[in-house]
Structure formats: structure tokens, C-alpha cells
């Protein structure tokens, strides 16, 4: 058997670090057998059999010029083997980021924090952590480790399925190369990394006969499990065309009637979602949808941009329980849907 331990990586390749002493091992001889070393294609003897180093070649302070193929020969001139030297660095701890689009699964991605220049693979696993004692804040790795299955297509990503929303997990991502291994441990709680996908199917429709109203509706993201005990809340933003500032409201359900649209102008609308108990963060915004209020009686005079102007809208009369409020600035609730006198918000 070969006296040379096979490092992880392609066969016949041995590894070293720039600036460090490197030992090459002749694979086809018995340990300690004296050999001669040559660079492939070069007749010059690098190290003779009388060096006292047996089957090894020592390169002091290796640099990039030392990379390449070496040949070792036994005393009788027989080929002891060929060795390719590749230089690089030991792994550094990878950088890891985890995210969850629902409350049952999460994924972790990683990236090297330093390129080693050597063949590299990643080992991924996780443990579930539990609290020690009812009043104790201490946590201990308790169950596992289990493998965190990696994407089959080679993306730097692994997924934990069937996670517990209230548990904490410790993710282990270990970068391995022929010169060693380096581990990043990351503590993750599903609650803190939860970020739903944006709502889907956003539609914006005019409300016939109401020149300052738009009805927006949407659905839960497809990735959100259909169970009633984990709901989403929503944030909706809208603005007239060519206006830079968004107005923001938090609708109660899966639709919202905007009552202060600018008559005659198209409006952009977008929605975002978040766990209804404020776990994690808001989703990214949905793609914008556009809608224009239905035509109605337009006020005779549209004031200059930058002024707020209110005009009654020609529409059926309904009892109005409270005076209307313009929604130029973000506020938690929109105008009461029954308001009979609506605002024409003319925005700068």
C-alpha cells in the first residue's frame, strides 16, 4: 500500500500552502525507500536518493512556481509515481444566512469568507436547542445533529423541513478542503428569520360611480401553509402616477378600498405581508399593480400640486358616522368605507 495518505480531492494531487514548507510523498514505493525527484519534463535532479528524506521531497517556502507535476524514481530507475502539487489555503469559516418563507421550514445559504484555491466541499447539519428548566435562560444542544439536506443542483443552500416555530436551532456549516476544515455555527430561531413571500394575485379595480375609489385585492402567497392558526397581516401602499411618495395603510383582510385616490389618474398599488403576531420581518413588496378610478364628476378646479384640496364627490348619499380624513400620510386605518364625502388628495 502507498505510504502517502490520500487527501480529499482528485487522486494523484498533493497540497500545500504558499509560503510554507511542503512535503511531497512518492506514492508507488515503500515508506522510507530512497527515491530521486524530478520536475515532469525536466532532466534536472531536484533531490537525490541520498538526501536522507526517503520517499519524501521537501520544498521550503513553496510558491506558485513550485506548482505542477513531479516524478519520483526508485534506485533502479523504476517509476515510483507522479505527483501534482497544488497550492492554496486552509478553509476559513464560511458566512451563513438563514431565512424562512413560512413557519414550518427554513433554508440556509452559505458562501466562503475567503477563497482557498483548492477543491472545497461543505458539510451541513443542525441541532434543535431546548431550554434547560422552566425558568432557565440557558440553552443546550439537545437533539440531533441531523443532516441539513443540500440542494441537489449544487447551489450553496440546505433546507430544514418540519421545523418547530417556537424552537431554536443551531446550524453547522463546515467548509472542508485538503488542508483542513473550518466550522461556522449559527443560532437560528424561526420566529426571527421568518419573512413571508409577497402576497400574490394583486388586482386593482375601479369602483363604478366613485371617481376617488379603487378596490385592491390579493391572496396569500402560495408558499404560506393553509392553517388557520398562523395568519398574515398586510401593508398596502399606493400612489398616483408620477408621484414619488407612497401612502401606506394596513388593511384588515385580503382587500382594501382606497377612498382618496386622485380622480382621473392611474395609481400604482403594492402589498407586503408579515406574520400577524409580528414575528420576523415584512416581506418584499409585491409587483406593482395599476388601476385608475372610474370616471365621475371631476371638481371644476384642480389646485396646484403640493396643496391638499377636498371636494365632495358626486355619489349616492350614505350616512357618515365620522368626518373623513385624508390619507396622505401613513396611518393604521384607511377612511371608513362608508364615508359619503371623500377627499380629493392632490399630492406633490
Amino acid at each position: 500500500s502507498s505510504p502517502c495518505p490520500q487527501a480529499w480531492g482528485p487522486p494523484g494531487v498533493q497540497y500545500g500552502q504558499p509560503g510554507r514548507s511542503v512535503k511531497l510523498c512518492c506514492p508507488g514505493v515503500t515508506a522510507g525507500d530512497p527515491v530521486s525527484w524530478f520536475r515532469d519534463g525536466e532532466p534536472k535532479l531536484l533531490q537525490g536518493p541520498d538526501s536522507g528524506l526517503g520517499h519524501e521531497l521537501v520544498l521550503a517556502q513553496a510558491d506558485s512556481t513550485d506548482e505542477g507535476t513531479y516524478i519520483c524514481q526508485t534506485l533502479d530507475g523504476a517509476l515510483g509515481g507522479t505527483v501534482t502539487l497544488q497550492l492554496g489555503y486552509p478553509p476559513a469559516r464560511p458566512v451563513v444566512s438563514c431565512q424562512a418563507a413560512d413557519y414550518e421550514n427554513f433554508s440556509c445559504t452559505w458562501s466562503p469568507s475567503q477563497i482557498s484555491g483548492l477543491p472545497t466541499r461543505y458539510l451541513t447539519s443542525y441541532r434543535k436547542k431546548t431550554v434547560l428548566g422552566a425558568d432557565s435562560q440557558r440553552r443546550s444542544p439537545s437533539t440531533g445533529p441531523w443532516p441539513c439536506p443540500q440542494d441537489p443542483l449544487g447551489a450553496a443552500r440546505c433546507v430544514v423541513h418540519g421545523a418547530e416555530f417556537w424552537s431554536q436551532y443551531r446550524i453547522n456549516v463546515t467548509e472542508v478542503n485538503p488542508l483542513g476544515a473550518s466550522t461556522r455555527l449559527l443560532d437560528v430561531s424561526l420566529q426571527s428569520i421568518l419573512r413571508p413571500d409577497p402576497p400574490q394575485g394583486l388586482r386593482v379595480e375601479s369602483v363604478p360611480g366613485y371617481p376617488r375609489r379603487l378596490r385592491a385585492s390579493w391572496t396569500y402567497p402560495a408558499s404560506w401553509p393553509c392553517q388557520p392558526h398562523f395568519l398574515l397581516k398586510f401593508r398596502l401602499q399606493y400612489r398616483p402616477a408620477q408621484h414619488p411618495a407612497w401612502s401606506t395603510v394596513e388593511p384588515a383582510g385580503l382587500e382594501e378600498v382606497i377612498t382618496d385616490a386622485v380622480a382621473g389618474l392611474p395609481h400604482a398599488v403594492r402589498v407586503s405581508a408579515r406574520d400577524f403576531l409580528d414575528a420576523g420581518t415584512w416581506s418584499t413588496w409585491s409587483p406593482e399593480a395599476w388601476g385608475t378610478p372610474s370616471t365621475g364628476t371631476i371638481p371644476k378646479e384642480i389646485p396646484a400640486w403640493g396643496q391638499l384640496h377636498t371636494q365632495p364627490e358626486v355619489e349616492p348619499q350614505v350616512d357618515s358616522p365620522a368626518p373623513p380624513r385624508p390619507s396622505l400620510q401613513p396611518h393604521p386605518r384607511l377612511l371608513d368605507h362608508r364615508d359619503s364625502v371623500e377627499q380629493v388628495a392632490v399630492l406633490a
Epitope: 451563513v96 452559505w110 458562501s111 466562503p112 469568507s113 475567503q114 477563497i115
Partner: antibody, heavy 118, light 107 residues
Framework: EVQLLESGGGLVQPGGSLRLSCAAS????????MTWVRQAPGKGLEWVSS????????QYAESVKGRFTISRDNSKNTLYLQMNSLRAEDTAVYYC???????????WGRGTLVTVSS | DIQMTQSPSSLSASVGDRVTITCQAS??????LNWYQQKPGKAPKLLIY???NLQTGVPSRFSGSGSGTDFTFTISSLQPEDIATYYC?????????FGPGTKVDIK
């Protein structure tokens, strides 16, 4: 010569924007994580943001999250920091620093001063 | 975030004195602790990495020790050129944090 050279600092009003650059030379820029660290006048060092060699993962201090964006162009050996919605408390010397790894800084630039004032 | 504390905040010592600075982390950081020197008007310089490893080219009078939450930085024989502020910094977390610094000057 192995070095980092920051540029792009200056005086800006609160709410304004600035883009810092850091030109790297003398080492294989694309192999290393890069970082911005800042130092307010007369104060200590504060880590701002880091980015991995491939540029696909970034990290930010809570104080700048959502306002600053770190990026890199490995073909130009350059690191960037886009700073938006600047505040008076962002006034500092901004240093660019190189790995090894993530979170150790073995090479620093000279720094560029950013002053946020009306 | 992991909080770092340093003591003392400043010290005066004579040339040739042994100088010791301590750094404490708010939680276990293994040995992921670096020490930096910053001279007035200059950028910081890495002296010690991973608690006890001397950075290439740094004089051997500088040393570091410790693990877990408690760390020590030592200048075995203070030299005039060592006047500076010294910072510890953890990188156990992916959000590195620095200590507040210790200003060292000559008596």
C-alpha cells in the same frame, strides 16, 4: 504594493447620499471578504458592513441597515459603500479593510472622512 | 450583538514596563478575538489574531492570551513607539464588534 485606497468622502446634508469607493491593489482582491469600519471623531471603531468574495452574502450593523449598501466589482478590484438617508451620527472616518476570513482585518486603507451637517 | 468591554480605558507607563490590557466579551467567543493598535491619525493595525497568534511582522513583545469570555493583551517591555490606542475585537459572531479601546501613553 499591497494597499487599499478609499475615496468619495465629503460634506453632505442630512438626508443626502454619498458613495464611497475603495481601490485594492497588490493582492487577489476577489479571494477575500471586504469590510467597511468607521470611526466617529474622537471615538472608537465601529464595524459597518462586510461582503464575501463572491458578493452573494452581505452583513450590516443595525445602525445602518436599510440605508447603506455594500457591493464589490471584482473585475475592477473595487469595494463600494452606497450611503443613503445620511444622519449627523454617520459623521466619521470610513475605513476599508480586507480579510482574512470574515471579521478579521489584516489590511486597512487610510480612511475617507464623511461629514453629515446642514 | 456581543458586547466587548476593555480595561483600563487609559494608562500611563514607563519605557520598559510590562503593560497589560484586559478585554471581556458578553458571551463565549471561543478564541475569536483580535487585538489592534491605532496610532493618532493612522489606520488600525492588526497585532494579534485569534487570541494568541502574532501577526506577521509584529514585534514579539506583543502577546495575547485567553479564551471564552476573558482575554489579556500584554506588551512585555513598553517602547516609545507603542504609544497608541489598543482595541480588542470579536469575530465569533458574523457581526464583529470592537471594544471601546485603551489609550496607552508614556509617563
Amino acid at each position: 504594493e499591497v494597499q487599499l485606497l478609499e475615496s468619495g468622502g465629503g460634506l453632505v446634508q442630512p438626508g443626502g447620499s454619498l458613495r464611497l469607493s475603495c481601490a485594492a491593489s497588490g493582492f487577489t482582491f476577489s479571494w477575500y471578504s471586504m469590510t467597511w469600519v468607521r470611526q466617529a471623531p474622537g471615538k472608537g471603531l465601529e464595524w459597518v458592513s462586510s461582503i464575501v468574495p463572491y458578493g452573494d452574502l452581505t452583513q450590516y450593523a443595525e445602525s445602518v441597515k436599510g440605508r447603506f449598501t455594500i457591493s464589490r466589482d471584482n473585475s475592477k478590484n473595487t469595494l463600494y459603500l452606497q450611503m443613503n438617508s445620511l444622519r449627523a451620527e454617520d459623521t466619521a472616518v470610513y475605513y476599508c479593510a480586507k480579510g482574512p476570513g470574515w471579521g478579521s482585518f489584516d489590511l486597512w486603507g487610510r480612511g475617507t472622512l464623511v461629514t453629515v451637517s446642514s | 450583538d456581543i458586547q466587548m468591554t476593555q480595561s483600563p480605558s487609559s494608562l500611563s507607563a514607563s519605557v520598559g514596563d510590562r503593560v497589560t490590557i484586559t478585554c471581556q466579551a458578553s458571551q463565549d467567543i471561543n478564541n475569536y478575538l483580535n487585538w489592534y493598535q491605532q496610532k493618532p491619525g493612522k489606520a488600525p493595525k492588526l497585532l494579534i489574531y485569534d487570541a494568541s497568534n502574532l501577526q506577521t511582522g509584529v514585534p514579539s513583545r506583543f502577546s495575547g492570551s485567553g479564551s471564552g469570555t476573558d482575554f489579556t493583551f500584554t506588551i512585555s517591555s513598553l517602547q516609545p513607539e507603542d504609544i497608541a490606542t489598543y482595541y480588542c475585537q470579536q469575530h465569533e459572531s458574523q457581526s464583529p464588534t470592537f471594544g471601546p479601546g485603551t489609550k496607552v501613553d508614556i509617563k
